[in-house]
């Protein structure tokens, strides 16, 4: 069989394409990539709203804060930031709004100091399970990431191909247990219908979790027990109907927690009694006096804190013989 023509003679089979990414000429100390603005004093490079189609190859080695927002990157290949010498100081990377729809395995490898990563407002239809871990090993080297911002990364409906977007994101968060040190995770505005039950247990260092503006209906199978460091939990603007006893007890048991529950369609029936009792006693819910009923109709806009057990009834279920058609 004929072999393809190639731009290199022979590479290792595991990463045959990294050579071109890494072998770019080392940038001059004060060089700034075309279409970017650089400040060596601030250790900052901004390549913003320039329709870049790839990550510049000649980023200065001093860069600590890199803004690549508002571009047309589309794809982040393996080793997208691999350089010789490596970008050893890069700590904050913002790629928001750059029309990324494919982030591949190992995209953020060779960034030993990367603590903050923002991929928000990109239609991530193809997020590799190994995007953050860089390897398909069952246990990867720990990622230095402390803050991961993934707000509004849900692709258009026609690009989701009948698969679980939640599952794809969670697979990337959990792969190789690389993100054990993650302290802030933002997943707002992603149309999440559910939270896979194992995700929080494997992110034990979380301080801040933002799940606002999703479509979460229930937290019944989600455990917060391990998140002993959690300080803020944003659940505003979801589809939550009620929080059950198990969830209430777990939240109450977290020593530093503040919970945000505004703008959920609370169903004020007999199942709400425990939550109302809890709300009246707890200090963990911020703005609890703003929480109001959405259903049933007769309870709409009633303030949860003002309800008593007599208000919270369930219509009796009639036996079949008494039901009318």
């Amino acid at each position: 069989s004929s072999s393809p023509t190639s731009s290199a003679s022979s590479f290792s089979s595991s990463a045959p394409f990294l050579a071109s990414a890494v072998s770019a000429q080392p940038p001059l100390p004060d060089q700034c990539p075309a279409l970017c603005e650089c400040s060596e004093a601030a250790r900052t490079v901004k390549c913003v709203n320039r329709n870049l189609t790839e990550v510049p190859t000649d980023l200065p080695a001093y860069v600590r804060n890199l803004f690549l927002t508002g571009n047309q990157l589309a794809v982040l290949p393996a080793g997208a930031f691999a350089r010789r010498p490596p970008l050893a100081e890069l700590a904050a990377l913002n790629l928001s709004g750059s029309r990324l729809d494919e982030v591949r395995a190992g995209a953020f490898e060779h960034l030993p100091s990367l603590r903050q990563l923002d991929l928000s407002h990109n239609p991530l239809a193809d997020l590799s399970p190994f995007a953050f871990s860089g390897s398909n090993a069952s246990v990867s080297a720990p990622s230095p990431l402390v803050e991961l911002i993934l707000n509004h990364i849900v692709p258009p409906e026609d690009e989701r191909q009948n698969r679980s977007f939640e599952g794809m994101v969670v697979a990337a968060l959990l792969a190789g247990r690389a993100l054990q040190g993650l302290r802030r995770l933002e997943l707002a505005s992603n149309h999440f219908l559910y939270l896979p039950r194992d995700v929080l247990a494997q992110l034990p260092s979380l301080r801040h979790l933002d799940l606002s503006n999703n479509s979460l209906v229930s937290l019944t199978y989600v455990s917060f027990r391990n998140l002993t460091h959690l300080e803020s939990l944003h659940l505003e603007d979801n589809a939550l109907k009620v929080l059950h006893n198990g969830t209430l007890a777990e939240l109450q048991g977290l020593p530093h927690i503040r919970v945000f529950l505004d703008n959920n369609p609370w169903v004020c029936d007999c199942h709400m009694a425990d939550m109302v009792t809890w709300l009246k006693e707890t200090e963990v819910v911020q703005g609890k006096d703003r929480l109001t009923c959405a259903y049933p109709e007769k309870m709409r806009n009633r303030v949860l804190l003002e309800l008593n057990s007599a208000d919270l009834d369930c219509d009796p279920i009639l036996p079949p013989s008494l039901q009318t058609s």
């Epitope: 990463a15 394409f17 071109s20 189609t53 510049p56 190859t57 589309a74």
Partner: antibody, heavy 117, light 108 residues
Framework: EVQLVESGGGLVKPGGSLKLSCAAS????????MHWVRQAPEKGLEWVGY????????YYADTVKGRFTISRDNAKNTLFLQMTSLRSEDTAIYYC??????????WGQGTTLTVSS | QLVLTQSPAIMSASPGEKVTITCSAT?????MHWFQQKPVTSPKLWIY???NLASGVPTRFSGSGSGTSYSLTISRMEAEDAATYYC???????????FGSGTKLEIK
């Protein structure tokens, strides 16, 4: 060593269909995006379409949209191009190409499609 | 839609001569890739991201440019450089990958 081998070309009548394959080896196929590119006789290179590493993103050139479908089987290290409603202007050598660190890093040797009555 | 126009379409150069091929884009692009294709063979990635030589490419080749104007230069033409060269870039979203019209370089 990276190898890409296309197959499935041949002579097809206008309006007919054909499926091309590209067998990949020498690299972790499932980690990289793949393109199809074609070259009509004595003409330049024309991009046909792209499929992402995990198969969930596919782009097509306007000239083939709705007629061609790109797919891949990561378990078998194989890329496919299903072509329907073929026209004489689809006559070309069809190449598969990797999108590794850069678009079109490696190319196969090509397979020839002739559309003629 | 982005159109990449190469000039000249055909040119010939003597051994040792300096050669420059240009690629003009209808709208500003952030970088350019170049490919070399010899008769009856597949194209090869030759220069990526405007100025980076692909592995194995002789150092007599260089690339430069910005905005709408890019070029590939051979400092001293050699017989093995005779080939057709294509520029390439991507535009829009969803992306469209566009190749230039090609420049056929012959040896005198």
């Amino acid at each position: 060593e990276v190898q890409l081998v296309e197959s499935g070309g041949g002579l097809v009548k206008p309006g007919g269909s054909l499926k091309l394959s590209c067998a990949a080896s020498g690299f972790t196929f499932s980690d990289y995006g793949m393109h199809w590119v074609r070259q009509a006789p004595e003409k330049g290179l024309e991009w046909v379409g792209y499929i992402s590493s995990g198969t969930y993103v596919v782009y097509y050139a306007d000239t083939v949209k709705g007629r061609f479908t790109i797919s891949r089987d990561n378990a078998k290290n194989t890329l496919f191009l299903q072509m329907t409603s073929l026209r004489s202007e689809d006559t070309a050598i069809y190449y598969c190409s990797t999108y590794g660190s850069n678009p079109f890093d490696y190319w196969g040797q090509g397979t020839t499609l002739t559309v003629s009555s | 839609q982005l159109v990449l126009t190469q000039s000249p379409a055909i040119m010939s150069a003597s051994p040792g001569e300096k050669v420059t091929i240009t690629c003009s884009a209808t709208s500003s692009v952030s970088s350019m890739h170049w490919f070399q294709q010899k008769p009856v063979t597949s194209p090869k990635l030759w220069i990526y991201s405007t100025s980076n030589l692909a592995s194995g490419v002789p150092t007599r080749f260089s690339g430069s440019g910005s905005g709408t104007s890019y070029s590939l230069t051979i400092s001293r033409m050699e017989a093995e450089d005779a080939a057709t060269y294509y520029c390439q870039q991507r535009s829009g979203y969803p992306p469209i990958f566009t190749f230039g019209s090609g420049t056929k370089l012959e040896i005198k």
